[in-house]
Structure formats: C-alpha cells, structure tokens
Amino acid sequence: ECGHISVSAPIVHLGDPITASCIIKQNCSHLDPEPQILWRLGAELQPGGRQQRLSDGTQESIITLPHLNHTQAFLSCCLNWGNSLQILDQVELRAGYPPAIPHNLSCLMNLTTSSLICQWEPGPETHLPTSFTLKSFKSRGNCQTQGDSILDCVPKDGQSHCCIPRKHLLLYQNMGIWVQAENALGTSMSPQLCLDPMDVVKLEPPMLRTMDPSPEAAPPQAGCLQLCWEPWQPGLHINQKCELRHKPQRGEASWALVGPLPLEALQYELCGLLPATAYTLQIRCIRWPLPGHWSDWSPSLELRTTERAPTVRLDTWWRQRQLDPRTVQLFWKPVPLEEDSGRIQGYVVSWRPSGQAGAILPLCNTTELSCTFHLPSEAQEVALVAYNSAGTSRPTPVVFSESRGPALTRLHAMARDPHSLWVGWEPPNPWPQGYVIEWGLGPPSASNSNKTWRMEQNGRATGFLLKENIRPFQLYEIIVTPLYQDTMGPSQHVYAYSQEMAPSHAPELHLKHIGKTWAQLEWVPEPPELGKSPLTHYTIFWTNAQNQSFSAILNASSRGFVLHGLEPASLYHIHLMAASQAGATNSTVLTLMTLTPEGSELH
C-alpha cells in the first residue's frame, strides 16, 4: 500500500465540512521523488489540497471539503501515473441527519393474535442507516415508576410497526411504550405512551344478518328493514356500543349513521328509509364505556325495503265507441300525492253490481294507462285503483254520464315554439270543475287511439300549454271538454301547427317567348301541402354577364313574368324564389340569351 487516507469523520451532517489527509510512504520507489497528490470526490477533482514532505520522507496532503452535500460519495487520493490517474486509497463518506423524533405512536390490542401492535411515523429521511426499536416496561401506576422491562421489539427492515406478543403483556395494567430511533449521528425518542393494552383493544365487527321472517311476526312497515347482528364471539363479554351505517345501492348518496346501538340487539327495525329500495348496511363496534378503538366496518349486508301501497290520485277520462256505446275506452294518469308515492305494478278497473254486497267484478287488469271494456248495461260507475305488492291506492270512481253541461266558447290555438302549442278558450257559465284537453295528429293522420290528454283541475283556467308530443310541421287536432260535478259539456275542437314548413321547392321556370330586349317566363305553381304554410309571394332574380343583379316581387297568384330592358345578344341567369311565412326556397337557374339586333323575335 503506497498511500493511506484518514478522515476527521466518515459520517457527518449533510452540508458540514470534512478534513482528510493522505500519506504516501517513501518506499514507493517507482514514484516521482516529488509526487503531486491529487484529490477526487466521486468523479470530480478537488482543488485545495495542501501538500508537504514530512521528516521521515513521506508525503502528506491535507484537504478540507467545506460542505459535504452528497449523502454518499467516495473520496480518493490519487497520483498522475503516465497519462492516467492512479488511485492510492479511497474512503466512503456519508452525510445525513440524526433521526427526527418518531411521532404519532399508537397501539392496538388484537385479541385474535393476542398481541399489541404499535405503529409510528419515522419522520423525514435521514439518508443514513437508522434503526427503530419499540421499547416498553410494565408499570403499576401511571408509568411514572418503571417496573419490569419488556424485551425490545425490533421491526423488520423498513417497517414502522412492531408486535409485542401476549407473553410480554399484562392486561389491565399500564405499560410505558416509546420508540427509539438511532443512527451514527444520534438517537431520538418518541413521547412515551402509557396504556393498558385492554384500553386500546380493537374488536372485530359483528356479522349483520337479515331477520328470518316468522309467521307470527308482523312484516316490516314500508321503508323499514328488519335485521340483527351476531356479535364477534371472542369479544362477547366486552361491553360495547355499535353504530350502523346505510346507503341506497343506487345513486351517489353518502352513508347515513344510526347509533349508538346495543351490541346484543336480538332484532332491530331500521325505519325512515325509502320504500322498495336496495340498501347496503354495515356495522362497527367499540368497547364502551371503557376505552377502546372502533372495529372495522363489517362486511356489507344488502337488503331491500318493503314497498308502500301507491299514494296517487288517478285523473281519468273516457270515450265511448260510436258504433257500440257500451264499449268504453277509459284513460287515466297517476298523479303522485307524496314525494315517494310508491311503485305502481298495475291498475284494476272493477264494478260492484248493486244488491250484491261484497261482490266486485274486475273489468280489466293492466299495466297500461288505458283499457277498453264492455260496460254492463246497469253499470253507471266503475272504480279504478293502482296496486303493488303492498296494497292499492284509494279507489277513484268513474261515472259514465251524458253531456249535459254548457260548452266552452272561442276555442283557439297558437304556436308558442316548434314543440309547444297554446290552446285558449272562454270558460262557460257556470264554471266547470276542470277540463280535459286531448290532442293528436289531425287529418290525414288522425287516430283516436294515439291522442295525448291532460286534466286541468282548475275550472277557472282559460288556456293550457301543450308541451307533450308536439312536433313541428304537423297539423294537430286539439279537443277541449269541460267537466262538471256529475256530467260534462260538449267537446270543442281546433286545428293548429306548432311550426309550419318553408316551401320544399320553388316552381321550375320555363321560357315562353324571347326577343332582343325582353323575355317572357312562366311556371306551374306547386300544389299546397299539409304542414306547409301558404305562399305569400314570389321574387324573380336575373343577373347579366357583368354580374349585375335585378329582381322583382310578384304576388303568390302569379303564373308568369316578362323581363324588360334586357341587352340584345346577352346572356342572363334567372331563378325564382317562392316564399311563405315559414321561409323561402329557390328554383333551379334558367340561363337564356337575348336575340341579336338582326334576329327576329321568337314566340
């Protein structure tokens, strides 16, 4: 060995100075008599080495690195040897920080593994090998006096938790517990915990179960769930309080908490939930009134609440077949009476014959919003109900009576926008109780079965906005019928468009006669179409070769037009625009050439 490095300290605080010396022995005969010692930190040459010859003939170089900013680096002592640098010796330098105080030390007692599990946060990176040790002792009091020490608990590399096994624990007695962190630059200790392992016990949650329905027990009410929980057996003798959380499976609702609940609820009814809704439920418990930790949430239980009978008003309307007045078509609409009015599974129309107490004859059972049935000759009234698995709505009586009430007057309709129509009227005297408004496609597409209808409950209303099933460019028939206490008035109807269509095409222009300075044009008007507003006018446009444009407006009954003042032997482009209130459309372009001055007129 020709050279040897010694350093003031191989491990320092990051950023601190470090001093190193390199001594080269005299007996390295192959060297220069006066060799120049060089220093290198990692791959970089370091200036500032002070070299001297010692009395024994050895050469010494001393260097001070003012700030070691590498967490790990090799410091080399070198000589130039020919064209290369010869390393005589090198040392590893490390820099970092002393360990910070470990914080957030907490422990849990696990009764299944019979161990106390403690965890902590080690603090910022030290850049140096740092060991953590969980230290503890038994204490009779509040940890002011130290009893027997407990064997140190050393976590596996990189872990920030450690388990103290049962044989080192004393339950119902306090233990002092802390974490010690140590590296080459120092030692630190966390604040000490003083705890009885049973006071940090973390229990397993109970198992949620649904109640097995018993024949004598009443079924749960709508919006309620019957459930029970099976306590975790090893924690059975520990007094606990529990809490339940639930949320609907669908949607974005957050968990709702219910508690505190007793651990030993043999059965529990949870109410105030949405009917006919699937819920996810979980439970957790904590030792109580003594200290402890909340258990994890239990595995989920998924249950569906029972539904409630429909709480709806049924608005009804009916029509008799013209050929067979005993065949009735009944229509209805459910109107919710509450925010949650219950699911509707279907509808039943029934009739109770007079004199037959209790006998109810169903006329139809359907999931649709209408049904057609034959009305028994003595029947003047039927009952309509909505039903589901929980029961039926209140029956809605439907009375079939003649039209004996007064008619409304001045029925009119106007477009609001392409998808709505306003229908207005003057109410009759006396005021009706309400109105039925029906609407559907007018001729030629009219159909009784495809009509939409609405009930207007306000008898003083003078109009109604139709927003359902209204499309532009269609003719609609609107029928309004006033409703009275036990009868109705005659129906009135009106036709209207919500939006009319511009002409689909303009007539084709034809040249009838042409001269040197004039041209006579004609066209065949398009036949009127349903859904398209009538023409208001035509505009004829002509352009010469110099791109000068001219136009003339003609009334909608025009069938032809003569262009005057044209240049002889000139080319013209002509087109016709047909316009209505809904828009305008252009014809194709007709190109013609006027005659030369020498030519004769063409007729």
Epitope: Q233, H237, N239
Partner: antibody, heavy 118, light 107 residues
Framework: EVQLLESGGGLVQPGGSLRLSCAAS????????MGWVRQAPGKGLEWVSS????????PYADSVKGRFTISRDNSKNTLYLQMNSLRAEDTAVYYC???????????WGQGTLVTVSS | DIQMTQSPSSLSASVGDRVTITCRAS??????LNWYQQKPGKAPKLLIY???NLQNGVPSRFSGSGSGTDFTLTISSLQPEDFATYYC?????????FGGGTKVEIK
C-alpha cells in the same frame, strides 16, 4: 370488595322447581356478564348458563336448555336461575360468578346446594 | 363444542417442586384459556386468565403459557397452600367448557 351471595337452594323432588338468587355488591353490577356454574358431588365444574350485562344474551348448556332460565334485575343487583323439571342429575352446588371481559369467571359466590331426590 | 382435556388427572409432589399441568383444546382457542384453583369445600378461585395473565392477588409462582390448542399452568415452587384441584376453562365461545381437573396432592 366484590361479594356474591347465593340463596334458594334446597331439597326438591324430581320434576319440581327451584329459583336461585345471587345478590351482588362491591362492583357496578349492570356492566358485567354474570353466570352460573355447578359442581356435582365429587365431580368437576360444569358451566350452566351466562347472561349479558343488559340481559339480552342468555346462552345455556345443552343439559339444561329448555328447563332453566337465567335472568337479572340490574336495579336490584340480583341474578336469578329459575330451574324447572328438575332431575336427579341436577343435584350439585350451584355457584354464581361474575365474568370478566375475556370470559373468565373472576369472582365466585360460596355456592348453594341443590338436591333433587324423591 | 370445544372439548377440554386436562392432564394429568392427579399428581403427587413435594413442597418446593416445580409442577406443570397441561390443558389441550379440541380446536384452536387463541389465548382464551383460564385456570382456576379449588380447595375442598370452597368456591373456585381464578388464577390465570387469557392464557398468561396473573389475576390480581395471585402469587407470581403461578404462570401460564401456550396458545391455540396447548396450554400449561406452571407452579415454579410448590407451597403447602397450593395443594388443591386445578381446572382449565375455555372462554372463546359458548358452551364454556371446563377441563376434568388435576388434583395436586402431597407426596
């Protein structure tokens, strides 16, 4: 100091009934599970029944299920064991015990002798 | 049901002896094992709970160990007042079964 005092033992004919009581003092009775353990003459210990702090959970040994009923009155700090349809094999000293959080029988009464014989 | 088997059923020992009694569960019971001492005509007394925890007031010569299915009660130096019958009991689940007992007699 925890004290448990059993009473109600005695001689009864097969098929008869007895009600044992256990008066508790020296601790908060309503916070603890309680139980009954019996010991037939010259035999080992046999667990009979336990009851949770509020009385909601009441497990029984198969040998007494359907015949014995455990109950408690937290307002009176008293534990009961109603024994019906008694059999000769129910003859034993019946001990009342206070249970700890880990199911251990922490404290015991002095016992009351029940003899079932014709 | 979890069955508890104690051995030996009886043993003779002298004052100062180290005595070991074992208890085996028919299935794993974690640390839910308790030891009791009973003297003739007296009520049982809790010695060790949760396999190794000494009940308050019990001399430190008594110790418990084991977990799962195999458990041991050790009396490090037998004293005259220790001659009695010892029972183990599992408290993991119901029914709570006791072992058959071990009678410690004077040799």
């Amino acid at each position: 100091e925890v004290q448990l005092l059993e009473s109600g033992g005695g001689l009864v004919q097969p098929g008869g009934s007895l009600r044992l009581s256990c008066a508790a003092s020296g601790f908060t009775f309503s916070l603890y599970w309680m139980g009954w353990v019996r010991q037939a003459p010259g035999k080992g210990l046999e667990w009979v029944s336990s009851i949770s702090s509020s009385g909601g959970v009441t497990p029984y040994a198969d040998s007494v299920k359907g015949r014995f009923t455990i109950s408690r009155d937290n307002s009176k700090n008293t534990l009961y064991l109603q024994m019906n349809s008694l059999r000769a094999e129910d003859t034993a000293v019946y001990y009342c015990a206070k249970l700890g959080e880990l199911g251990q029988f922490m404290d015991w009464g002095q016992g009351t002798l029940v003899t079932v014989s014709s | 049901d979890i069955q508890m088997t104690q051995s030996p059923s009886s043993l003779s020992a002298s004052v100062g002896d180290r005595v070991t009694i074992t208890c085996r569960a028919s299935q794993g019971i974690s640390s839910y094992l308790n030891w009791y001492q009973q003297k003739p005509g007296k009520a049982p007394k809790l010695l060790i709970y949760y396999a190794s925890n000494l009940q308050n007031g019990v001399p430190s010569r008594f110790s418990g160990s084991g977990s799962g299915t195999d458990f041991t009660l050790t009396i490090s130096s037998l004293q005259p007042e220790d001659f009695a019958t010892y029972y183990c009991q599992q408290s993991l689940e119901y029914p709570q079964m006791f072992g058959g007992g071990t009678k410690v007699e004077i040799k």
